[in-house]
Interface confidence: low
């Protein structure tokens, strides 16, 4: 009889185990396990009649179609076969085993005691067959295997085979290379690969093969399982496999399509081809004179761009229009978008004018093109050029006009300070003076009402500023409430610069009238004492500087005592008169305790930021006018004058042992050149 | 007072000459700089020409450079402007104006002139200013 | 060039703005009331204003733009405003801007 078995493990015994088996018997025992798993048998006890060939007695183990092992015996002779320690594996899930004894047995034989498990198949490891086996990667479970792919491949359908997703693959410039997936290793399985080639409409593309090409073929069929496909338009060429390349292939065509097909199985290297463009020819281009066109080729094609570009100290000009470059390009009618353009020398153009300064050509006919050079020089003896700068420049490749230390900024001529055309052959006084010679002061201002009246003095510091006493920018105040308010101050619209004047109230040619842009006061001026009594006025335009006009030095130290000083104005003479011309005294400075005892019982303080001169015995002294007006003084190394003063107050004018006391420039000297930017 | 009286304008033909005279009073004319300014019917203020206190230095505006000529005759106290080549668009009202003070010039170009707190109207700039005005001649150019 | 907006408008007792531009660094402003009008200068020299003139007008200047502010705007502040400037060889008008007062 024939029992089934169907669980994962069992026992199988002879008939009336542990018992002698009965004869004439005959049990088969079929035992089947899930799929992925296979049948280990073994035997604990076994006892069976001996005979040759095991022909009386025996066990028989067998699949469908196959006999694993036929048993029979107490132990292995030469033509009978014991289990022992023997284990009986089925190549399947399915396993039969027969039991049989003859009509007699000669002893008694106890059977056999055997036991059956199932045992999972390792699939990934027994696998042979390629069919049947994973392309890439085998997985192992109990009961059954799995198969995966590398990176970048997907698993077929098929669950077995690894494809590549291929089919979405453009190009759209004008050479390239396509390749199989995985070149030159073997391409993979299974896969549908396309290749477009999309360009512009007017290419034309070439293909050609390269390198290895190595598709599954077949000596019969031709291109049955991989193969290449062209598609030009309606056209298609191929199939194409094996090991020998297709010849190049021309398309006539800007839009092709490649297909790839691959099936399930081979390990073949693949293909690579390489695509150009080609289009219709342009005639031979000639690079401008001073020029030239980039890239240079021997022949130009459609699409082909050069661009034009001119040697150093050119430009290119094209319709009238100067620039840098000028890209032309290969139509598809195999004509130039353009004509080459020209290339012109540079031209920087007329040099922009200086302020106070001329220029001189040094090359010919007044060049003004690329290497020219020119030279700016200050307009001498009145101005002169700022860190002594050569003056030289030249016209760049860049258009502008280039100075080695200045780059393309303008040099500056800076106003001559303190050196008159004039020098004073006698002295003179203002209060008990004589007039001063005309041009020998041409620093001095006069400070005056619209209507033309004079009221103060200055000095011409630089180009645009005038430095005098702060006093002589507000309105007396109130001695009840003596505080400085900005409605005491005069508005820059209420009064006037003259300068290069001489007579105070007729007028010259030389005179200068010049508006106020803006007043200064110094921050520390206290109009009660008189201290910081110094102003700073901008003027709205710079004055032209002549022998008349020029500006003041500003003192390099301190005033040495003793030091002869000029003291100019136009303020009052004797009996409260006021002079025809300008006047002028020499006096001496005065020691300051001197002055300081002077005006002690005054009550009056003489603080640091003032300097005192004048004789003992009085008579020279600046006078009611005079205020904000110039001290100044001759160093005789350098031949040039210096700011000491302004005119600021005393008690009375010309007193015996009643100094003038004048506001010291040298104290204010880093306010006055903060406010001014004036350097010496 | 200031006046400044111009004549000369009237109905002009296309190609043809024009002459204005501007006739001064009130004050120094020969310290003066002087300048013609224009007002297109319709439009806006617009300079024509300009001229220093001595007569050394002049200037024009674009439009009618080469075809203009300021002069003046400090001792008649007139100011004159010559205009060739008539165009349509010379048509419009012919101020002569004053300068603010004294001195102002060409000659130099950062010379300022400053206007004076008389009162009177004056116009401003950088370079130039004028604060009195004539009533204006009426130049019609028309075939 | 000088470049002004054509026309602006403002309520009685209210603010208005002008402004120009151009390239100059020194600019006036001048009031014409009728066509054929002596002309009137309100501010000169950007900031500055002539003593004739009302404080309610004022100019100011930042970069090369020029404003002129009336501030309390009166029925007889109705007229065309010119701005304008002069280089080393010319002066120049802006088009002008015409004030309407509401």
């Known amino acids: 009889h024939t029992v089934e078995l169907n669980n994962m493990f069992g026992q199988i015994q002879s008939p009336g185990y542990p018992d002698s088996y009965p004869s004439d018997s005959e049990v088969t025992w079929n035992i089947t396990v899930p799929d992925g798993f296979r049948i280990k048998l073994y035997f604990m006890h076994f006892n069976l009649e001996s005979s040759y060939l095991c022909e009386y007695d025996y066990v028989k183990v067998e699949t469908e179609d196959q006999v694993l092992a036929t048993f029979c015996g107490r132990e292995t002779t030469d033509t009978e076969q014991t289990p022992g320690q023997e284990v009986v594996l089925s190549p399947g899930s399915f396993m039969s085993i027969t039991f049989r004894s003859d009509f007699s047995n000669e002893e008694r034989f106890t059977g056999f005691d055997a036991h059956y498990m199932a045992v999972d198949v390792d699939e990934c490891k027994e696998r042979e067959d390629e069919e049947l086996s994973c392309d890439h990667y085998c997985h192992n479970y109990i009961g059954g295997y799995y198969c995966s792919c590398r990176f970048g491949y997907i698993l077929h359908t098929d669950n077995r085979t690894c494809r590549v997703e291929c089919s979405d693959n453009l190009f759209t410039q004008r050479t390239g290379v396509i390749t199989s997936p995985d070149f030159p290793n073997p391409y993979p399985k299974s896969s549908e690969c396309l290749y477009t080639i999309e360009l512009e409409e007017g290419f034309m593309v070439n293909l050609q093969f390269e390198d290895i090409f190595d598709i599954e073929d077949h000596p019969e069929v031709p291109c049955p399982y991989d193969y290449i496909k062209i598609k030009v338009g309606p056209k298609v060429l191929g199939p194409f496999c094996g090991e020998k390349a297709p010849e190049p292939i021309s398309t006539q065509s800007h839009s092709v399509l490649i297909l790839f097909h691959s099936d399930n199985s081979g390990e073949n290297r693949g293909w690579r081809l390489s695509y150009r463009a080609a289009g219709n020819e342009c005639p031979e281009l000639q690079p401008p004179v001073h020029g030239k066109i980039e890239p240079s080729q021997a022949k130009y094609f459609f699409k082909d761009q050069v661009l034009v570009s001119c040697d150093t100290g050119y430009k290119v000009l094209k319709d009238n229009v100067e620039m840098d470059t000028f890209q032309i390009e290969c139509l598809k009618d195999g004509t130039w978008s353009n004509k080459i353009p020209t290339c012109k020398i540079v031209d920087c153009r007329a040099p922009g004018e200086l302020e106070h300064g001329l220029i001189t050509f040094s090359t010919r006919n007044n060049l003004t093109t690329y290497k020219s050079e020119i030279k700016y020089s200050c307009q001498e003896p009145y101005y002169k050029m700022l860190n002594n700068n050569t003056g030289i420049y030249t016209c760049s490749a860049q258009g502008v006009w280039m100075n080695k230390v200045l780059g393309r900024s303008l040099p500056t001529c800076l106003p001559v300070c303190g050196l008159p055309k004039f020098s004073r052959k006698l002295m003179a006084r203002i209060f008990n003076g004589r007039p001063a010679q005309k041009g020998t002061t041409p620093w001095i201002a006069m400070l005056s009402h619209l209507n033309g009246q004079p009221f103060c003095g200055g000095s011409l510091l630089g180009s645009s500023w005038i430095v005098t006493a702060a006093h002589c920018l507000h309105q007396s105040l109130d001695p009840e409430d003596p505080t400085l308010r900005d409605s005491d101050l005069l508005s820059p619209s209420d009064f006037k610069i003259i300068l290069g004047k001489h007579w105070r109230l007729r007028s010259d040619e030389n005179e200068q009238h010049l508006g106020v842009k803006h007043t200064t006061l110094h921050p520390q001026y206290d109009p009660n004492t008189f201290e910081n009594d110094v102003a700073l006025v901008e003027l709205l335009e710079s004055p032209v500087l002549n022998a008349f006009v020029m500006p003041i030095c500003l003192p390099e130290g301190p005033q040495q005592e003793g030091a002869m000083v000029i003291v100019s104005g136009w303020g009052k003479q004797f009996l409260q008169r006021f002079p025809e011309t300008l006047m002028e005294i020499e006096i001496p400075i005065v020691d300051h305790s001197t002055c300081q005892k002077a005006y002690a019982p005054l009550k009056k303080k003489v603080t640091r930021d003032m300097i005192c001169a004048g004789e003992k015995e009085g008579g020279k002294d600046a006078c009611a006018g005079d205020s904000g007006g110039p001290m100044v003084t001759l160093n005789r190394e350098r031949g040039q004058w210096y700011l000491v003063g302004t005119v600021s107050w005393g008690d009375d004018c010309g007193k015996k042992d009643r100094y003038g006391v004048y506001s010291y420039i040298h104290h204010n000297k880093d306010w006055i050149q903060r406010v001014t930017g004036v350097r010496n | 007072a200031v006046t400044l009286d111009e004549s000369g304008g009237g109905l002009q033909t296309p190609g043809g000459a024009l002459s204005l005279v501007c006739k001064a009073s009130?004050?120094?004319?020969?310290?003066?700089?002087m300048g013609w300014v224009r007002q297109a019917p319709g439009k806006g203020l617009e300079w024509v020409a300009g001229i220093d206190d001595d007569g050394s230095g002049t200037r024009y505006a674009p439009a009618v450079k080469g075809r203009a000529t300021i002069s003046r005759d400090n001792g008649q106290s007139t100011l004159r402007l010559q205009l060739n080549n008539l165009r349509a668009e010379d048509t419009g009202t012919y101020y002569c104006?004053?300068?603010?003070?004294?001195?102002?010039?060409?000659?130099?170009?950062?010379?300022?002139?400053?206007?004076?707190?008389?009162?009177?109207?004056?116009?401003?700039?950088?370079?130039?200013?004028?604060?009195?005005w004539g009533h204006g001649t009426e130049v019609i150019v028309s075939s | 060039a000088l470049t002004q907006p054509s026309s602006v408008s403002a309520n009685p007792g209210g603010t208005v703005k002008i402004t120009c531009s151009g390239d100059?660094?020194?600019y006036g402003w001048y009031q014409q009331k009728a066509p054929g009008s002596a002309p009137v200068t309100v501010i000169y020299d950007n900031t500055n204003r002539p003593s004739n003139i009302p404080s309610r007008f004022s100019g100011s200047k930042s970069g090369s733009t020029a404003t002129l502010t009336i501030t309390g705007v009166r029925a007889d502040d109705n007229a065309v405003y010119y701005c304008a400037s002069t280089d080393s060889s010319s002066t120049a008008f802006g088009a002008g801007t015409t004030l309407t007062v509401l």
């Open positions: 104006a004053k300068t603010c003070e004294p001195g102002t010039t060409f000659k130099d170009k950062c010379n300022t002139c400053r206007c004076g707190s008389d009162g009177k109207s004056a116009f401003c700039t950088r370079k130039l200013c004028y604060q009195a």
């Open positions: 009130g004050f120094t004319f020969s310290s003066n700089a």
């Open positions: 100059s660094s020194y």
